[in-house]
């Protein structure tokens, strides 16, 4: 029986050009974690494997850094980074646990937001 639960950072927002840490935490299980995958929709961002360590997908190498812990740091954010991110914990004997994070990347400064909503 799968007793574990995944706690995530939930729905988060960050500014364009900035960085954000995506984090998931598996608890309430003694199952052995063998690998953690990070995915954006259907794209693989990174893998942390017990024996092989971290692998960052080549297309994200310049903008993704592993850590802290099993988290993932996304840098130089663009509006295109808005969307769903998934952490997938592969465990034995429980199986797979999945956590979901929604990231919204906002246009940069508060001043810009203010200007956009000025009354003519």
């Amino acid at each position: 029986m799968m007793t574990g639960t995944i706690e995530t950072t939930g729905n988060i927002s960050a500014e364009k050009g900035g960085s954000i840490i995506l984090q998931c935490h598996l608890s309430s299980t003694t199952a052995q974690v063998t690998q953690v995958n990070w995915e954006q929709q259907d794209q693989l961002l990174a893998i942390c494997n017990a024996d092989l360590g971290w692998h960052i997908s080549p297309s994200f190498k310049d903008r993704v850094a592993p850590g802290p812990g099993l988290g993932l740091t996304l840098q130089s954010l663009t509006v295109n980074d808005t969307g769903e991110y998934f952490c997938i914990y592969h465990t034995y004997p429980d199986g797979t646990y999945t956590g979901r994070i929604f990231l919204e990347v906002l246009e940069s400064s508060v001043a810009e937001h203010g200007a956009r909503f000025q009354i003519p």
Partner: antibody, heavy 117, light 107 residues
């Protein structure tokens, strides 16, 4: 098997600098964070900082930022910690430790640094 | 920075006893808490990772529990080889930090 090899000891003069090494073997060096930890005689453990050899990314405890430089040589799978402007407060055992899926799962034997005139 | 407070600082026990060591974080670190054992003149050794995950090669008498700010390392039926200092460490945020340690000594 995974090993982190560190020199047993270093003796340096106050005011000088030293470069401590940590040679990794038995795994893909560029895929695991390497951390450095300080332990003064009979005291607790202090996290100094880390480096990801795959990119050179570093993080430091603020306390050590002006004292420490972390580098790697991927061709020899070796991590280095450069300590500058040494004082007696820097006398300690310095460990390198690897972080992967299971946190700090491998440790070096530690280098005992003695700062003395 | 996240401060980890371990208690008690020293624990005097007899082989065969069972003990619980506490580690409290100054803010939530979810499950990003690890336990180490260090014997005199040796490097630390990882016992439990991510609060409750066991490590291959570590005796089953060691177990971990907790989440958020309160964590416990339990050792069932202590053996003489278990005496030493135990440290907790968090990897939730940089800078990583260690607790001050609990010394387990023979009564």
């Amino acid at each position: 098997q995974v090993q982190l090899q560190q020199p047993g000891s270093e003796l340096v003069r106050p005011g000088a600098s030293v470069k401590l090494s940590c040679k990794a073997s038995g795994y893909t060096f560029t895929s695991f964070w390497m951390h450095w930890v300080k332990q003064r005689h009979g005291q607790g453990l202090e996290w100094i900082g880390n480096i990801y050899p795959g990119s050179g990314t570093t993080n430091f405890d603020e306390k050590f930022k002006s004292k420490v430089t972390l580098t790697v040589d991927t061709s020899s799978s070796t991590a280095f910690m450069h300590l500058s402007s040494l004082t007696s407060e820097d006398s300690a055992v310095y460990y390198c430790t690897r972080e992967g899926l299971y946190a700090f799962d491998q440790w070096g034997q530690g280098t005992t640094l003695t700062v003395s005139s | 920075d996240i401060v980890l407070t371990q208690s008690p600082a020293t624990l005097s026990v007899t082989p065969g006893d069972s003990v619980s060591l506490s580690c409290r974080a100054s803010q939530s670190i979810r499950s990003s808490l690890h336990w180490f054992q260090q014997k005199s003149h040796e490097s630390p050794r990882l016992l439990i990772t991510y609060a409750s995950q066991s490590i291959s090669g570590i005796p089953s008498r060691f177990s971990g529990s907790g989440s958020g700010t309160d964590f416990t390392l339990s050792i069932n039926s202590l053996e003489t080889e278990d005496f030493g200092v135990y440290f907790c460490q968090q990897s939730n945020t940089w800078p990583y930090t260690f607790g001050g340690g609990t010394k387990l000594e023979i009564k």
